[in-house]
Interface confidence: low
């Protein structure tokens, strides 16, 4: 009953909402959003001893404070600073894995290679992964009906600003050799408009990051092209090099074999290329 008590005030069924509520183009807040965030926080802090000091009620309060009662097209990074402060976490040098348009494989990889971390392996990323949320100006209600769409409504919405804020922070605190997993099946393997291309690349700190190593993941079994020569990868190399960070690129021709070899590096078939 603890969770229910905490969130009783937040429970509103969609049919109970006032008819004048703002209609946005995007889907509404994920069902049971407050309960989900709190439950994820509790689970995360139980599994990660270094975060056991975190008070999940305070985390939820800070999360809620970032968007509740605020016009959902006017959210700023500053709104999330109290939450960012509570969720401060560091990744050891050489252990940061960024990704772009290939989230599932990146997460499968860090589930096997437990000493590497994506943003979603960190507390704040874990809390918000795959969730949608927004509030409404001057009410304490969560909008479960609709939320702003990044393209059709506005970019300064609660979800987009959250990911921009935590992605910036994640990149800023990375050090050593940073890895990024890119989707070789897409027309733009490196997309300047992605979160990686627009936020993370520009917030890697040359004083702390010696190199960025891109892993280009191939989609087709028979695809033997060197996608590291792709024009968009050359564009990424140029951006990174101008920032005094070395750049390396590797083709991952067989992602299934790649994961298998991460699990069992001694397997004889792993001595050949992947």
């Amino acid at each position: 009953s603890g969770l229910n008590d905490i969130f009783e005030a937040q429970k509103i069924e969609w049919h109970e909402l006032p008819r004048w509520r703002q209609q946005w183009s995007g889907s509404g807040t994920t069902s049971r959003f407050p309960e989900t965030v709190l439950a994820r926080c509790v689970k995360y802090t139980e599994v990660h001893p270094e975060m056991r000091h975190v008070d999940c009620q305070s985390v939820w309060d800070a999360f809620k404070g970032a968007f509740i009662s605020k016009y959902p097209c006017n959210i700023t990074e500053e709104d999330y600073q109290p939450l960012v402060k509570l969720g401060t976490q560091t990744v050891p040098c050489n252990k940061t894995l960024l990704w772009s348009r290939i989230k599932d494989l990146a997460h499968q990889f860090t589930q096997v290679q437990r000493d590497m971390f994506t943003l979603e392996d960190m507390l704040l990323g874990y809390l918000a992964d795959d969730l949608t949320w927004c509030g409404e100006f001057n009410t304490f209600e969560i909008n479960y009906q609709s939320c702003p769409d990044w393209r059709k409504d506005c970019s300064n919405n609660p979800v987009s600003v959250f990911w921009k804020t935590v992605s910036r922070r994640f990149a800023e605190t990375a050090c050593g050799v940073v890895h990024v997993m890119l989707n070789g099946s897409r027309s733009k393997i490196f997309d300047k408009n992605s979160t990686f291309g627009s936020v993370e690349v520009h917030n890697l700190q040359p004083e702390k990051v010696q190199a960025l190593e891109a892993w280009v993941i191939h989609g087709g079994r028979e695809d033997s092209r060197d996608l590291c020569q792709d024009p968009t990868i050359k564009e990424l190399e140029s951006i990174i090099s101008k920032r005094n960070i070395r750049f390396f690129c590797k083709n991952i021709y067989r992602p299934d074999k790649f994961l298998q070899c991460v699990k069992n590096p001694e397997d004889s078939s792993c001595l050949s290329g992947i």
């Epitope: 560091t90 990744v91 800023e172 050090c175 050593g176 700190q205 040359p206 004083e207 702390k208 010696q210």
Partner: antibody, heavy 117, light 110 residues
Framework: QEQLEESGGDLVKPEGSLTLTCTAS????????ICWVRQAPGKGLEWIAC???????TYYASWAKGRFSISKTSSTTVTLQMTSLTVADTATYFC???????????WGPGTLVTVSS | AQVLTQTPSPVSAAVGGTVTINCQAS????????LAWYQQKPGQPPKLLIY???NLASGVPSRFSASGSGTQFTLTISEVQSDDAATYYC??????????FGGGTEVVVK
Amino acid sequence: QEQLEESGGDLVKPEGSLTLTCTASGFSFSNDAICWVRQAPGKGLEWIACIYAGSGNTYYASWAKGRFSISKTSSTTVTLQMTSLTVADTATYFCASADTIDYFNLWGPGTLVTVSS
Amino acid sequence: AQVLTQTPSPVSAAVGGTVTINCQASQSVYNNNYLAWYQQKPGQPPKLLIYRASNLASGVPSRFSASGSGTQFTLTISEVQSDDAATYYCQAYYRDPTTAFGGGTEVVVK
């Protein structure tokens, strides 16, 4: 409670040497920049040097190169070695940490270095 | 070498009034916004007020605000309180990488 504390401040003679230590409590230097800043009596703040704990890279103010050396000696300590000290080096020396790179969000109380014959 | 010039100093303000402090950089700061403001009281270390030109640091009252870009930056204290009497410093970060502090502006509250 995250805190920084400087130690090693002393009275030294001109041309003498001194090593200051910055110690973290409540956290360890992992990805932080740890820097030294000094303040002469009645004067403004002056940046000396930074070390990036993750990479070990060091950066110095142009005037500090050669006489000052910053190093990370453990996960919670950073030192500043100062040589060929002059009267102009008399100041309170602060260590400060930056969890990004461009601003100092945590400061120690400072340690006084007096250079006098 | 990069120079940060703060004006005016000292500056006097009445309780409840507004104070504006300017900081001019001899060359553009990194990313046009890598500039911070600090408050320092006698016998104490500096305290971060503003980072990245306009972002309020954690726990700092909203009476403090700042703006600017490139080489020109401003710190504003509205509804000045006696506790705001202190010296204020701007600090710029350059990609060299070097850091420079302004000379400081003393705020006297009457």
